[in-house]
């Protein structure tokens, strides 16, 4: 499947997951906490203030680094998976904190968490630049 299609599909699935998670958690627009979001890279479930959300490396990095293997599991398609099985010390895990002011930026940033072979990218496929 073309990378652009993968991302459109991922985004659509993300919005569905967020809607289901909102229902399960009793979240609405006026709820304190952080709304679920698609940050154009990966999907983040809704969270309460003080909660740290962990995700494994998104699909984008399987396009960027096709040979990269992460020890952590990929979060399931039908829900957000069990983030308790992920650990920040693992390669391939990114976190965001939900604070009173909203979401923090990813930690570590995606490249540091998911690996990026800069040399290999020089000769790699160039079709990702118009991904939405």
């Amino acid at each position: 499947m073309h990378s652009d299609c993968i991302f459109k599909k991922e985004q659509a699935m993300c919005l569905e997951k967020i809607q289901r998670a909102n229902e399960l958690m009793g979240f609405n627009d006026s709820s304190p906490g952080c709304p679920g979001m698609w940050d154009n890279i990966t999907c983040w479930k809704p969270a309460h203030v003080g909660e740290m959300v962990l995700v494994s490396c998104p699909e984008l990095f399987r396009i960027f680094n096709p040979d990269q293997v992460w020890e952590t599991e990929t979060i399931g398609e039908s829900d957000f998976g069990d983030s308790n099985s992920l650990d920040l010390s693992d390669m391939g895990v990114v976190s965001r904190n939900c604070t009173e002011d909203g979401w923090s930026e990813p930690f570590p940033h995606y490249f540091d968490a998911c690996g990026f072979d800069e040399y290999e990218s020089e000769t790699g496929d160039q079709d990702y630049y118009y991904l939405s």
């Epitope: 154009n40 002011d101 930690f107 995606y110 490249f111 540091d112 990026f116 020089e122 990702y128 118009y130």
Partner: antibody, heavy 120, light 107 residues
Framework: QVQLVESGGGVVQPGRSLRLSCAAS????????MHWVRQAPGKGLEWVAV????????YYARSVKGRFTISRDNSKNTLYLQMNSLRAEDTALFYC?????????????WGQGTLVTVSS | EIVLTQSPATLSLSPGERATLSCRAS??????LHWYQQKPGQAPRLLIK???QSLSGIPARFSGSGSGTDFTLTISSLEPEDFAVYYC?????????FGPGTKVDIK
């Protein structure tokens, strides 16, 4: 090697506009976030804006929000900063920097800067 | 926005001495705190990422520590080329911010 070359600076009157460019080479531009950071004469660094690898995410400092627009053309390996309604306090050396990430990241390589002087 | 405060503003030391620079954040930035060196007429250079992670090409005399709100950059033994301005930068919360800088000059 990573190379970033800024251009477009100059002297401009308050209230007018200017567009800065940053030509990138030595890395796969379309995979990296890019930042603009400025430095007023004799002062410290001030973060201005960042754009994600594909232009889908753009974020700004409060001091420039609504006046400056960051954009990129991945087919030309070029980053832009459109500056409108310029003020005297915008006078600074403007650096473009690569963000080590797809989304935002921290600046890891910097250009040499282009000087913008806002004066009547 | 997160305000970064650096101290001291100026540090006057001699070559061979140890330099200890501080950066304090107005709220927690976790470990998303990075250090830069800037020499007159030059662009900044990334020295340390994520509070304590060293980078290739950066001399081992530069080290960082801290997390949350309090961070330290240490230069174990100052070389003549280390006299410069040092900035901390947080990438934990948008809008990103830099500290005002610490100037390390020759006593």
């Amino acid at each position: 090697q990573v190379q970033l070359v800024e251009s477009g600076g100059g002297v401009v009157q308050p209230g007018r506009s200017l567009r800065l460019s940053c030509a990138a080479s030595g890395f796969t531009f379309s995979r990296f976030a890019m930042h603009w950071v400025r430095q007023a004469p004799g002062k410290g660094l001030e973060w201005v804006a960042v754009i994600s690898y594909n232009g889908g995410n753009k974020y700004y400092a409060r001091s420039v929000k609504g006046r400056f627009t960051i954009s990129r053309d991945n087919s030309k390996n070029t980053l832009y900063l459109q500056m409108n309604s310029l003020r005297a306090e915008d006078t600074a050396l403007f650096y473009c920097a690569r963000g080590y990430d797809v989304l935002t990241g921290y600046p890891d390589y910097w250009g040499q800067g282009t000087l913008v002087t806002v004066s009547s | 926005e997160i305000v970064l405060t650096q101290s001291p503003a100026t540090l006057s030391l001699s070559p061979g001495e140890r330099a200890t620079l501080s950066c304090r954040a107005s709220q927690s930035v976790g470990r998303s705190l990075h250090w830069y060196q800037q020499k007159p007429g030059q662009a900044p250079r990334l020295l340390i990422k994520y509070a304590s992670q060293s980078l290739s090409g950066i001399p081992a005399r530069f080290s960082g520590s801290g997390s949350g709100t309090d961070f330290t950059l240490t230069i174990s033994s100052l070389e003549p080329e280390d006299f410069a301005v040092y900035y901390c930068h947080q990438s934990s919360r948008l809008p990103f911010t830099f500290g005002p800088g610490t100037k390390v000059d020759i006593k």
